[in-house]
Amino acid sequence: LIIGFGISGRHSITVTTVASAGNIGEDGILSCTFEPDIKLSDIVIQWLKEGVLGLVHEFKEGKDELSEQDEMFRGRTAVFADQVIVGNASLRLKNVQLTDAGTYKCYIITSKGKGNANLEYKTGAFSMPEVNVDYNASSETLRCEAPRWFPQPTVVWASQVDQGANFSEVSNTSFELNSENVTMKVVSVLYNVTINNTYSCMIENDIAKATGDIKVTESEIKRRSHLQLLNSKAS
């Protein structure tokens, strides 16, 4: 969470951003809020990116003003038009690219003053893992697959019964480059699994952490997975 202020005294407004991460090829959101104005005509939102000459996006006098927009963002940005009046300047970024990573500035002008805050935006690929029993293997084996990750993540197995155990000797992880030559498919196999136990396959890079759980009993198999973005700390 980053809170920025304007110049001084009554001419400053508070602008707040939250560091976030974008998933390559999908839509992302750069989060920014500000002290709302009561009327739309006086609100100006400017998004800028460090190292980029043109604007990322500008919203002014109630509409997008894109004449100064940088080519790399053409046709890929939008504010939430209905939310601007209540202080939401967040930017939707379509088809996130690896090169969209960097430092962005959310700059706001209202009838009450000016303010800005920076936002660190990371880009990469992350996806939910799915853990299945590999019935083709000769022994009881679990297979954890996640279709898209970048940068290359680490994969760690854990077990509810054998807490703290190191499974690196009885697991094998491979990374297969996807067709677009950036993201990779993650496949990790865990051997010698025991019944009536819950196993977790944890995939993590500097952007996201995802976990796929599987509980194997004699009568049923239960699966659960979740993904968490690793936002940078408050500053």
Epitope: E35, P36, L40, K63, I85
Partner: antibody, heavy 115, light 107 residues
Framework: EVQLVQSGAEVKKPGASVKVSCKAS????????MNWVRQAPGQRLEWMGG????????EYNEKFKGRVTITVDTSASTAYMELSSLRSEDTAVYYC????????WGQGTLVTVSS | DIVMTQSPSSLSASVGDRVTITCKAS??????VAWYQQKPGKAPKLLIS???YRYTGVPSRFSGSGSGTDFTFTISSLQPEDIATYYC?????????FGGGTKVEIK
């Protein structure tokens, strides 16, 4: 759940003042504008003004400037609208409404000005 | 002040009919127009903000369109519970102003 609960109906004599309260709950009171709107019988809705509690920023409709005073008590999450020098045409239902989209409204307070 | 001229002032339609209300602003308000529904003895309720964005929980039969000075509010299939007065409002500049209202009745 967002709720705006207004004070009860008032009957006032011409020339007097009235103060209507609006107690907010279910959201962060200081981070949204609170507006006051009135509706006289057979008339259109009329925005009187608004206040941003966090900063005390106030915007008034010029039509009411000098007669209307909007205040807040942030510790009680309550907004107030005081209208002075009342005349018969001020007879109306007065509403408080949250944020610049008027997304939530109070139940209304009937103010009757009569001699 | 920006004047919002709403028409018609009243209309009568059958259940299932498509109902259209128009609102004309005296100057350009971009897309800063909201629509409210008010039932007798009740406070208004926000239906549409920023011309076309349905507010949370508002049925999909309500929609809005337009920009600049001309705006339209539509009920695609009128229901008995839609009997009310509908108001447009601009939040582009102060003073914020409302239309005169359209009273919708069932035939």
């Amino acid at each position: 759940e967002v709720q705006l609960v207004q004070s009860g109906a008032e009957v006032k004599k011409p020339g007097a003042s009235v103060k209507v309260s609006c107690k907010a709950s279910g959201y962060t009171f200081t981070s949204s504008w609170m507006n006051w709107v009135r509706q006289a019988p057979g008339q259109r809705l009329e925005w009187m003004g608004g206040i941003y509690p966090n900063r005390g920023n106030i915007e008034y409709n010029e039509k009411f400037k000098g007669r209307v005073t909007i205040t807040v008590d942030t510790s009680a999450s309550t907004a107030y609208m005081e209208l002075s020098s009342l005349r018969s045409e001020d007879t109306a239902v007065y509403y408080c409404a949250r944020d610049s989209r008027f997304s939530y409204w109070g139940q209304g307070t009937l103010v009757t000005v009569s001699s | 002040d920006i004047v919002m001229t709403q028409s018609p002032s009243s209309l009568s339609a059958s259940v299932g009919d498509r109902v259209t209300i128009t609102c004309k602003a005296s100057q350009d308000v971009r897309t800063a127009v909201a629509w409210y529904q008010q039932k007798p003895g009740k406070a208004p309720k926000l239906l549409i903000s920023s011309t076309s964005y349905r507010y949370t929980g508002v049925p999909s039969r309500f929609s809005g369109s337009g920009s600049g000075t001309d705006f339209t509010f539509t009920i695609s299939s009128l229901q008995p519970e839609d009997i009310a007065t509908y108001y447009c409002q601009q939040h582009y500049s102060t003073p914020l102003t409302f239309g005169g209202g359209t009273k919708v009745e069932i035939k």
